[in-house]
């Protein structure tokens, strides 16, 4: 004879457990049905009647099989510096991610709690580490023989052009100027970009001479909040 299938609610065997998509109701002392994603328990089970499920109301959701009395509220609408990458439905919460040119400074379980604009490196400095969805741009001073004349979140330091005869030597924020119109080796005229998962926010500025040096290792430091800095400019 085939084994009998127990229909919910049913009393589990002593020491036994309820099946998949069922839960043990302490009050009824029975195995009862869970509600599917997008629904919640409107009426809990008894010894003689199973769980009664109902659809989640607008702006609420349940993502898993459950027996919660109320659906979870979807998160607040995405802020102006965010884009909604997943809408609020009866089965999933809204997910907000940072818009292009921004990164997530404070993450939450899904999506981002706080976005911040990607920093840009000023002339004389290039991008040492590009921004990602969750980390800011890191700048570095352009090494001797290289320069950056832009304020950009993507431009790296690029080599000075090599001249037969130098009219104006290059520095960290300016390319060399040759007397001849045909240098022996000329780099591409435009700035060199690092690939990023977020869009470029590059703007050209007047060159600002800055000291240059070779790139090096990093210093181990903690992250923390800063008071508003209103420091003086560079040399």
């Amino acid at each position: 004879l085939p084994a009998q299938v127990a229909f919910t609610p049913y009393a589990p065997e002593p020491g036994g457990t309820c099946r998949l998509r069922e839960y043990y109701d302490q009050t009824a002392q029975m195995c009862c049905s869970k509600c599917p994603p997008g629904q919640h328990a409107k009426v809990f089970c008894t010894k003689t009647s199973d769980t009664v499920c109902d659809s989640c109301e607008d702006s609420t959701y349940t993502q898993l099989w459950n027996w919660v009395p109320e659906c979870l509220s979807c998160g607040s609408r995405c802020s102006s510096d965010q884009v909604e990458t997943q809408a609020c439905t009866r089965e999933q919460n809204r997910i907000c991610t940072c818009r292009p040119g921004w990164y997530c400074a404070l993450t939450k379980q899904e999506g981002c709690r706080l976005c911040a604009p990607l920093r840009k490196c000023r002339p004389g400095f290039g991008v040492a580490r590009p921004g990602t969805e969750t980390s800011d741009v890191v700048c570095k001073p352009c090494a001797p023989g290289t320069f950056s004349n832009t304020t950009s979140s993507t431009d790296i330091c690029r080599p000075h052009q090599i001249c037969n005869v130098v009219a104006v030597p290059g520095n960290a924020s300016m390319d060399a100027v040759c007397t001849s119109t045909s240098p022996t080796r000329s780099m591409a005229p435009g700035p060199v970009h690092l690939p990023q998962p977020v869009s470029t926010r590059s703007q050209h500025t007047q060159p600002t001479p800055a000291p240059s040096t070779a790139p090096g290792t990093s210093f181990l430091l903690p992250v923390g909040p800063s008071p508003p800095a209103e420091g003086s400019t560079g040399d």
Partner: nanobody
């Protein structure tokens, strides 16, 4: 707890010397640029000195060139500022900061996600 802790401040006569230290502790990350800011009463915060780790690149404000020296001990994870020939104008609260603002090559100073210390008071009397 994440912290940058300054020490070495105090009161000194004009012409005297002090050495400020900045020790990093807590959850750490790799920072390229370290520096010192100061703020005198009623004045804006001023960048004093900065350096990129492992390079020759250093920045000094015009007002401290030739008198102040920035350095670091990577083994101790500590940044220093040696201040010689101190002047009354050097009085203020000195802050240690990491990977911050304009003097480290960024286009602005208004980034609230960088590391800052609580500051140490330096008073120079004539």
């Amino acid at each position: 707890q994440v912290q940058l802790v300054e020490s070495g401040g105090g009161s000194v006569q004009a012409g005297g010397s002090l050495r400020l230290s900045c020790a990093a502790s807590g959850h750490t990350y790799r920072s390229n640029c370290m520096g010192w800011f100061r703020q005198a009463p009623g004045k804006e915060r001023e960048g004093v000195a900065a350096m990129y780790t492992g390079t020759d690149w250093k920045y000094y404000a015009d007002s401290v060139k030739g008198r102040f020296t920035i350095s670091q001990d990577k083994a101790k994870n500590t940044l220093y500022l040696v201040m010689n020939n101190l002047k009354p104008d050097d009085t203020g609260v000195y802050y240690c900061a990491a990977d911050f603002g304009f003097i480290c090559g960024y286009d602005s100073d208004d980034d609230p996600y960088d590391a800052w210390g609580q500051g140490t008071q330096v008073t120079v009397s004539s």
